[in-house]
């Protein structure tokens, strides 16, 4: 059994997340994850899911009753999702911590928008003509 | 020239994002994107970047002066990043809209944690024995 299982069970007790009513109104993450089989699509979704859990854990970081559980799960996420690569984790954290209401951040984001957009599709790495062909229907990942 | 370029230039004017001082203290996104060549790593980072821009655009959605520009750019993101796949975009939006302070959402998230964790690494799709081998150093994605 992976180490996170016991700690996740501890969190379930703490949050009363084992109660039958928790399953009402569908799932938050599981149904969405089932929709996406392509690795790159899964990463798009998992990126949001992981940032949600990190925010959740941050809100409860000073609660001694679950601190060990939270730390174990965070460590496990770092091994599994970030491949134990601290640079990857640090870059991810930077992105999640930018404040969308900070006017300096807004200006920088808009300043960088053209270059960000140019790199958004995997096609960005190949020639322009090839790219326009792809957008004419060459691509069929779903 | 891609349609977003003209509209992004319009946003730059609106936010005074063409001023020389905008480049002070490094980039928000561009240096991070340069660090990651693997497609799945890029998607992890781009997922956060796209959600940032969507939040930013939401904050300015009622401003008539940039409404057309914002709509054009969002449409272009949908084509490039979400492959014109509305289901992908909808799932992404759901994930970005969950409130981390809502106790029902917290309980659901904790309830689903074990299953989410089990799927976090690409190794999750293969047998348990193979996964433990991978963590013993079999993997070399970069």
């Amino acid at each position: 059994q992976d180490p996170y299982v016991k700690e996740a069970e501890n969190l379930k007790k703490y949050f009363n997340a084992g109660d039958p009513d928790v399953a009402d109104n569908g799932t938050l993450f599981l149904d969405i994850l089932r929709n996406w089989k392509e690795e790159s699509d899964r990463k798009i979704m998992q990126s949001q899911i992981v940032s949600f859990y990190f925010k959740l854990f941050k809100n409860f970081k000073d609660d001694q009753r679950i601190q060990k559980s939270v730390e174990t799960i965070k460590e496990d996420i770092n091994v599994k999702f970030f491949n134990s690569n601290k640079k990857k984790r640090d870059d991810f954290e930077k992105l999640t911590n930018y404040s969308v209401t900070d006017s300096n951040v807004q200006r920088k984001a808009v300043h960088e928008l053209i270059q960000v957009m140019a790199e958004l599709s995997p096609a960005a790495k190949i020639g322009k003509r090839k790219r326009s062909q792809m957008f004419r229907g060459r691509r069929a990942s779903q | 020239q891609d349609p977003y370029v003209k509209e992004a230039e319009n946003l730059k004017k609106y936010f005074n994002a063409g001023d020389p001082d905008v480049a002070d203290n490094g980039t928000l996104f561009l240096d991070i994107l340069r660090n990651w060549k693997e497609e799945s790593d890029r998607k992890i980072m781009q997922s956060q970047i796209v959600s940032f821009y969507f939040k930013l655009f939401k904050n300015f959605k009622d401003d008539q002066r940039i409404q057309k520009s914002v709509e054009t750019i969002k449409e272009d993101i949908n084509v490039k990043f979400f492959n014109s796949n509305k289901k992908k975009r909808d799932d992404f939006e759901k994930l970005t809209n969950y409130s981390v302070t809502d106790s029902n959402v917290q309980r659901k998230a904790v309830h689903e944690l074990i299953q989410v964790m089990a799927e976090l690494s690409p190794a999750a799709k293969i047998g348990k024995r193979k996964r433990s081998q991978m963590f013993r150093g079999r993997r070399a994605s970069q």
Epitope: E71, T72, E75, N78, V79, N83, K87, K88 | W36, S141
Partner: antibody, heavy 124, light 112 residues
Framework: EVQLVESGGGLVKPGDSLTVSCVAS????????IHWVRQAPGKGLEWVAT????????FYSDSLRGRFTVSRDNAANSVYLHMSSLRGEDTALYYC?????????????????WGRGTLVTVSS | NFMLTQPLSVSGYPGKTIVISCVRS????????VQWFQQRPGSAPAMVIY?????PSGIPDRFSGSVDASSNSASLTISGLKTEDEADYFC??????????FGGGTKLTVLG
């Protein structure tokens, strides 16, 4: 003050087994990954294995996997490296090194703190 | 196979600046942090640069680290060379999942 103290080295014959130990102090041991790094006489540094903190995942050098096993006892602030089927080329100074705390995004640097090493000599 | 390649030896006069390179053979150098270690004879390695360009406390600002994606390499620069800088220097990075990788080491000789 962070301290890592290795022990258990010595002279062994080819084919024998040996376990070297490392006792840590001065930090919350269970939070940190621990690496084993070795250095043959007059040679460079070679990473051997790593064990994660609370989750105890094991990572090995491709060239050593199968013969070496890393483990830890968080209650005893200790980490162990069990080496079997030892060969002459395993003769080296074995260092215990503190890694990252991967549960903390502000963790101190990886490989910042090293022990003084324990010498393993494999010879007939 | 992943390798970090360093020059076998580098030398310089006191007060001068030397640069030790560390070239990554495959994968992107920018995708993993790079550390640098100094090792004097009979001592354990001591970190002089961590996470590409940061100095641990107690390391003078004569030591600096950088990464250049275009050459897929990292560099350690030591300015105002001193005789006590004479030592072996190792770069270190990662590949895969927590696989630690060391360069072969560079012997720095301070001349004169």
């Amino acid at each position: 003050e962070v301290q890592l103290v290795e022990s258990g080295g010595g002279l062994v014959k080819p084919g024998d087994s040996l376990t070297v130990s490392c006792v840590a102090s001065g930090f919350t041991f269970s939070n940190y990954f621990i690496h084993w790094v070795r250095q043959a006489p007059g040679k460079g540094l070679e990473w051997v294995a790593t064990i994660s903190g609370r989750t105890k995942y094991m990572f090995y050098s491709d060239s050593l996997r199968g013969r070496f096993t890393v483990s830890r006892d968080n209650a005893a602030n200790s980490v162990y490296l069990h080496m079997s089927s030892l060969r002459g080329e395993d003769t080296a100074l074995y260092y215990c090194v503190r890694g990252y705390d991967h549960s903390d995004s502000n963790s101190a640097a990886d490989l910042l703190h090293w022990g003084r090493g324990t010498l393993v000599t494999v010879s007939s | 196979n992943f390798m970090l390649t360093q020059p076998l030896s580098v030398s310089g006069y006191p007060g001068k600046t030397i640069v030790i390179s560390c070239v990554r053979s495959s994968g992107s150098v920018a995708s993993h942090y790079v550390q640098w270690f100094q090792q004097r004879p009979g001592s354990a390695p001591a970190m002089v640069i961590y996470e590409d360009s940061h100095r641990p406390s107690g390391i003078p600002d004569r030591f600096s680290g950088s990464v250049d994606a275009s050459s897929n390499s990292a560099s350690l620069t030591i300015s105002g060379l001193k005789t006590e800088d004479e030592a072996d220097y190792f770069c270190q990075s990662y590949y895969g999942n927590n696989q630690v990788l060391f360069g072969g080491g560079t012997k720095l000789t301070v001349l004169g």
